[in-house]
C-alpha cells in the first residue's frame, strides 16, 4: 500500500498536461501537486479528463482548501464545477461577475441546477442586492430566474435593475412577486413619456392598483388582453365598464373570448348589465 | 365570523327534485367581493362543485349538471338555496355549501348534509 | 372543462417526512390553484390560494407553487395532525374543477 501511494519514478507532473490522462486514479493523487493544480486549473478543460480523473482533482483541491477555494481557482473550475456539491459551494466567496459567468457557462442550456441555485445564492448575497449586471447575466442564463426568487428576496432589487428586466423574464412570475417588482419599475421608468412608459411598464402591470390601471385608462394606452387578463382580480373589479372600454381601446373586443376566465369572469359579474350592454359585446352579469 | 349552514331533507326519493337551503351568518350575502357555491362529495369519493350565485341573481352551473340545476338567493333572508331535479341514486353525496371568496377561493365551508336518493 | 389531474393517489409517509403532491391541469389555469385538506366526516379547509398563497391561519410547513398546468403541494416536515386527503381545485375557468384527490396515510 506504501509503495502504491508513492509516486513512481518519472511520473512526478511538472505540469497540468495531456499525458496526465493516461494516469491512473492513484498515480493522479500521488503525482500530481494540489498547488500545482491549482495555479494552473485553466488547463484543466482543455484535457479531456475521465469522471473518475476529475473526482481525485476534485479530491486534492479539497484538501488543499478545506475552508473553501479561493475565487482564481474557482473562476477557472470548468467542468470541475459539475463535480461540486452545494456544501462545497456555501464555503466559497465567489465577488467577480466573471467567475460567475464562467460557471454558469458551464451548466449552459441545462436547467437550474441546486449546484448553480447555490452558487447564485452566495453571489447575490455577497453583493447585498441583485444589481443590473448581476440580473442582466442571470436573466439571460435563466430567463425565468426573477421569477423563481421570494417576494422577500425580490426587495433586494434595487429600481436601477428594472432596466435590465425583459418581458419574457417576467412569464412566470406570480402575483405576490409582481407586487414587489411593480413599484419598483413605476420608480424606475417615472420619468418616461406617457407611451414609452407605457411599453415599459407593461410587463410589470400585474402588481399595479386600481389607481394606477384608472390613471392609465385616460391614457389611450390600448392594452391587449393578455396584459389584462394578467392584472390582480382586487385591482379590476372596482374599474367601470367605460374605464376598461378606455383602458382596452380596440382590444375591448377580446373581452367576450375571455368572458368565462378570471379575471374578467369576476369583473363582469360585478357590473350592471346596462353597462356591460354598452359595449354590444353580449356579456352577461 | 362568517358561518354556513345547510338544511334541508336527508332523504328524496328517485326522480324527485332535492332541495337544500344554505343560511349565512355572520356576514352578508350581498357582499361585494363574495360569490356562494354548492359541492358535493358522494361516499368514499372526491369534491364535484355544483354551481354558484352572486347576490344580483347571476349564476354559474357546472356543465355536467346544468339541466337539473337551479340556485337561487334570497339577499332579505340571508340565504342562498340549491335546487336539483330528477335525481337518482348517484346524487347520493355530502351537500356543502361555501363562500367562494373572489381573492382566494373556498374559505368557508358549511359542515356539509348527507342527502340519500332512495325509494 | 379544465381537468385537474392529481398524483399520488394516496401516500406512505413518517411524521417529519417532507411530503409532495402535484397536479396537473389538462390546459392553462394561469396562477388560479387552490389546495384543500380534508379530515374524515370534516368539511374541506383551504390552505393555498391562486397556487402559493398561504392562508391564514395555516401553518407554513405548508407551501405551494406552480403556474399553467403544473402546481405542487409541499408539507416540509409532515405532522400527525396532518395526515388526511388533500384536493387541488381550479378557478381560472367558469368550471370550477377539483383534481381526484391524494390521501396521506401513517407509514
Known amino acids: 500500500e506504501v509503495e502504491k501511494t508513492a509516486c513512481p519514478s518519472g511520473k512526478k507532473a511538472r505540469e497540468i498536461d495531456e499525458s496526465l490522462i493516461f494516469y491512473k486514479k492513484w498515480e493522479l493523487e500521488a503525482c500530481v501537486d494540489a498547488a500545482l493544480l491549482a495555479t494552473q486549473m485553466d488547463r484543466v478543460n482543455a484535457i479531456p479528463f475521465t469522471y473518475e480523473q476529475l473526482d481525485v482533482l476534485k479530491h486534492k483541491l479539497d484538501e488543499l482548501y478545506p475552508q473553501g477555494y479561493p475565487e482564481s481557482v474557482i473562476q477557472h473550475l470548468g467542468y470541475l464545477f459539475l463535480k461540486m456539491s452545494p456544501e462545497d459551494i456555501r464555503k466559497w466567496n465567489v465577488t467577480s461577475l466573471e467567475t460567475l459567468k464562467a460557471l454558469l457557462e458551464v451548466n449552459k442550456g441545462h436547467e437550474m441546477s441546486p449546484q448553480v441555485a447555490t452558487l447564485i445564492d452566495r453571489f447575490v448575497k455577497g453583493r447585498g442586492q441583485l444589481d443590473k449586471d448581476t440580473l442582466d447575466t442571470l436573466t439571460a442564463f435563466y430567463p425565468g430566474y426573477l421569477c423563481s426568487l421570494s417576494p422577500e428576496e425580490l426587495s433586494s432589487v434595487p429600481p436601477s435593475s428594472i432596466w435590465a428586466v425583459r418581458p419574457q423574464d417576467l412569464d412566470t412570475c406570480d402575483p405576490r412577486q409582481l407586487d414587489v417588482l411593480y413599484p419598483k419599475a413605476r420608480l424606475a421608468f417615472q420619468n418616461m413619456n406617457g407611451s414609452e412608459y407605457f411599453v415599459k411598464i407593461q410587463s410589470f402591470l400585474g402588481g399595479a392598483p386600481t389607481e394606477d390601471l384608472k390613471a392609465l385608462s385616460q391614457q389611450n394606452v390600448s392594452m391587449d388582453l393578455a396584459t389584462f387578463m394578467k392584472l390582480r382580480t382586487d385591482a379590476v373589479l372596482p374599474l367601470t365598464v367605460a374605464e376598461v372600454q378606455k383602458l382596452l381601446g380596440p382590444h375591448v373586443e377580446g373581452l367576450k373570448a375571455e368572458e368565462r376566465h378570471r379575471p374578467v369572469r369576476d369583473w363582469i359579474l360585478r357590473q350592471r348589465q346596462d353597462d356591460l350592454d354598452t359595449l354590444g359585446l353580449g356579456l352577461q352579469g | 365570523q362568517v358561518q354556513l349552514q345547510e338544511s334541508g331533507p336527508g332523504l328524496v326519493k328517485p326522480s324527485e327534485t332535492l332541495s337544500l337551503t344554505c343560511t349565512v351568518s355572520g356576514g352578508s350575502v350581498s357582499s361585494f367581493t363574495d360569490t356562494w357555491s354548492w359541492i358535493r362529495q358522494p361516499p368514499g369519493k372526491g369534491l364535484e362543485w355544483i354551481g354558484y350565485i352572486y347576490y344580483s341573481g347571476s349564476t354559474n352551473y357546472n356543465p355536467s349538471l346544468k339541466s337539473r340545476v337551479t340556485i337561487s338567493v334570497d339577499t332579505s333572508k340571508n340565504q342562498f338555496s340549491l335546487k336539483l331535479s330528477s335525481v337518482t341514486a348517484a346524487d347520493t353525496a355530502v351537500y356543502y355549501c361555501?363562500?367562494?371568496?373572489?381573492?382566494?377561493?373556498?374559505?368557508?365551508w358549511g359542515q356539509g348534509t348527507m342527502v340519500t336518493v332512495s325509494s | 372543462d379544465i381537468q385537474m389531474t392529481q398524483s399520488p393517489s394516496s401516500l406512505s409517509a413518517s411524521v417529519g417526512d417532507r411530503v409532495t403532491i402535484t397536479c396537473r391541469a389538462s390546459?392553462?389555469?394561469?396562477?388560479?390553484v387552490n389546495w384543500y385538506q380534508q379530515k374524515p366526516g370534516k368539511a374541506p379547509k383551504l390552505l393555498i390560494y391562486?397556487?402559493?398563497s398561504l392562508q391564514s391561519g395555516v401553518p407554513s410547513r405548508f407551501s405551494g407553487s406552480g403556474s399553467g398546468t403544473d402546481f405542487t403541494l409541499t408539507i416540509s416536515s409532515l405532522q400527525p395532525e396532518d395526515f388526511a386527503t388533500y384536493y387541488c381545485?381550479?378557478?381560472?375557468?367558469?368550471?370550477?374543477?377539483f383534481g381526484g384527490g391524494t390521501k396521506v396515510e401513517i407509514k
Open positions: 381545485q381550479q378557478s381560472y375557468d367558469a368550471s370550477y374543477t
Open positions: 361555501a363562500r367562494d371568496f373572489v381573492l382566494s377561493g373556498f374559505d368557508i
Open positions: 390546459q392553462s389555469s394561469r396562477y388560479y
Open positions: 391562486a397556487a402559493s
